[in-house]
């Protein structure tokens, strides 16, 4: 499955939108920084078969979509930017879903992939727990926004590596 060029453009657009979503100066939030233990090895495309990498990407985008689709998220961000951001993620999910169906038919996805998807889910659980503990404060959301920008950048890099493998 060849991910369309529009997919990586969508990812870049999502990053730009996320960058524009800030409501307060991040300079006031230094002390709120937190180690979410991003599972960086899951974004290293070299150790994966293509089907596995696509599954990890899908899980990453799905969890990001879920995180920004909550009521608490709606209260935190400017509505039109949030809607545009969610639309970009939704389009990426559609692209990836088509690929997952196509690729899983070609390759048997081993158990290792389930571990990778679980690692991504646990990562987002840590992010959600942090927001709950910080009572969804503006600074907590700023820290999460910065973290998601970083993980989306890792996703973009994984997609680039996938395209080079084609």
């Amino acid at each position: 499955c060849d991910l369309p060029q529009t997919h990586s453009l969508g990812n870049r657009r999502a990053l730009i939108l996320l960058g524009q979503m800030g409501r307060i100066s991040p300079f006031s939030c230094l002390k709120d920084r937190h180690d979410f233990r991003i599972p960086q090895e899951e974004f290293d495309g070299n150790q994966f078969q293509k089907a596995q990498a696509i599954s990890v990407l899908h899980e990453m985008i799905q969890q990001t979509f879920n995180l920004f689709s909550t009521e608490d998220s709606s209260a935190a961000w400017e509505q039109s930017l949030l809607e545009k951001f969610s639309t970009e993620l939704y389009q990426q999910l559609n692209d990836l879903e088509a690929c997952v169906i196509q690729e899983v038919g070609v390759e048997e996805t081993p158990l290792m992939n389930e571990d990778s998807i679980l690692a991504v889910r646990k990562y987002f659980q840590r992010i959600t727990l942090y927001l709950i503990e910080r009572k969804y404060s503006p600074c907590a959301w700023e820290v999460v926004r910065a973290e998601i920008m970083r993980s989306l950048s890792f996703s973009t890099n994984l997609q680039k590596r996938l395209r080079r493998k084609d």
């Epitope: 230094l30 920084r33 180690d35």
Partner: antibody
Framework: EVQLVQSGAEVKKPGESLKISCKGS????????IGWVRQMPGKGLEWMGI????????AYSPSFQGQVTISADKSISTAYLQWSSLKASDTAMYYC??????????????WGQGTLVTVSS | DIQMTQSPSSLSASVGDRVTITCRAS??????LNWYQQKPGKAPKLLIY???SLQSGVPSRFSGSGSGTDFTLTISSLQPEDFATYYC?????????FGQGTKVEIK
């Protein structure tokens, strides 16, 4: 390879203006903040201020607020530190360094080589 | 502003010695503390971040500990290349502030 390359040494007269630069390469320039640090001859390190190149948001130390201006041009991955009217007491080595912003990553992990500014009549 | 106080301001030690430098913050900074090494005519170099995390490429003889207001940088066995000035820096809130430095000299 991550690099921050600063402009060369400057010799100026009191009252003159000056703009020094710090060019980032080998990483996504807008993903990190750029901080500026002063070191006067034989003295310690003093944090002056910081900029987020993605939107040019700045924060200054109260000691330097109104004395200097920090700016950035993300199109050429360069941050700047400028003075409109130099004083002899501005004589120092000035360093730029990158900061990961709100991400959990090492602060000021890469530094420029420094720009020596000498202000003398 | 958060004040950072380092002690001692200078010390003399021999190669192989265990060296400890302390840093105290005027208020709690959790674990938001960094340690830098600076040699004459060179830019500072990050050694330890978030109080105890060793920066990539830094020898394991360097270690950091502490939280709240009291922090320590330890060099387990001083090497010839370790003679330099060391600075702590709080990363808790702006304005960022440095300690006044500790100069480690050859005995």
């Amino acid at each position: 390879e991550v690099q921050l390359v600063q402009s060369g040494a400057e010799v100026k007269k009191p009252g003159e203006s000056l703009k020094i630069s710090c060019k980032g390469s080998g990483y996504s320039f807008t993903s990190y903040w750029i901080g500026w640090v002063r070191q006067m001859p034989g003295k310690g390190l003093e944090w002056m201020g910081i900029i987020d190149p993605s939107d040019s948001d700045t924060a200054y130390s109260p000691s330097f607020q109104g004395q200097v201006t920090i700016s950035a041009d993300k199109s050429i991955s360069t941050a700047y530190l400028q003075w409109s009217s130099l004083k002899a007491s501005d004589t120092a080595m000035y360093y730029c360094a990158r900061h990961p912003g709100l991400n959990w990553a090492p602060d000021f992990d890469y530094w420029g080589q420094g720009t020596l500014v000498t202000v003398s009549s | 502003d958060i004040q950072m106080t380092q002690s001692p301001s200078s010390l003399s030690a021999s190669v192989g010695d265990r060296v400890t430098i302390t840093c105290r913050a005027s208020q709690s900074i959790d674990e938001f503390l960094n340690w830098y090494q600076q040699k004459p005519g060179k830019a500072p170099k990050l050694l330890i971040y978030f109080a105890s995390s060793l920066q990539s490429g830094v020898p394991s003889r360097f270690s950091g500990s502490g939280s709240g207001t009291d922090f320590t940088l330890t060099i387990s066995s001083l090497q010839p290349e370790d003679f330099a000035t060391y600075y702590c820096q709080q990363a808790h809130s702006f304005p960022l502030t440095f300690g006044q430095g500790t100069k480690v000299e050859i005995k």
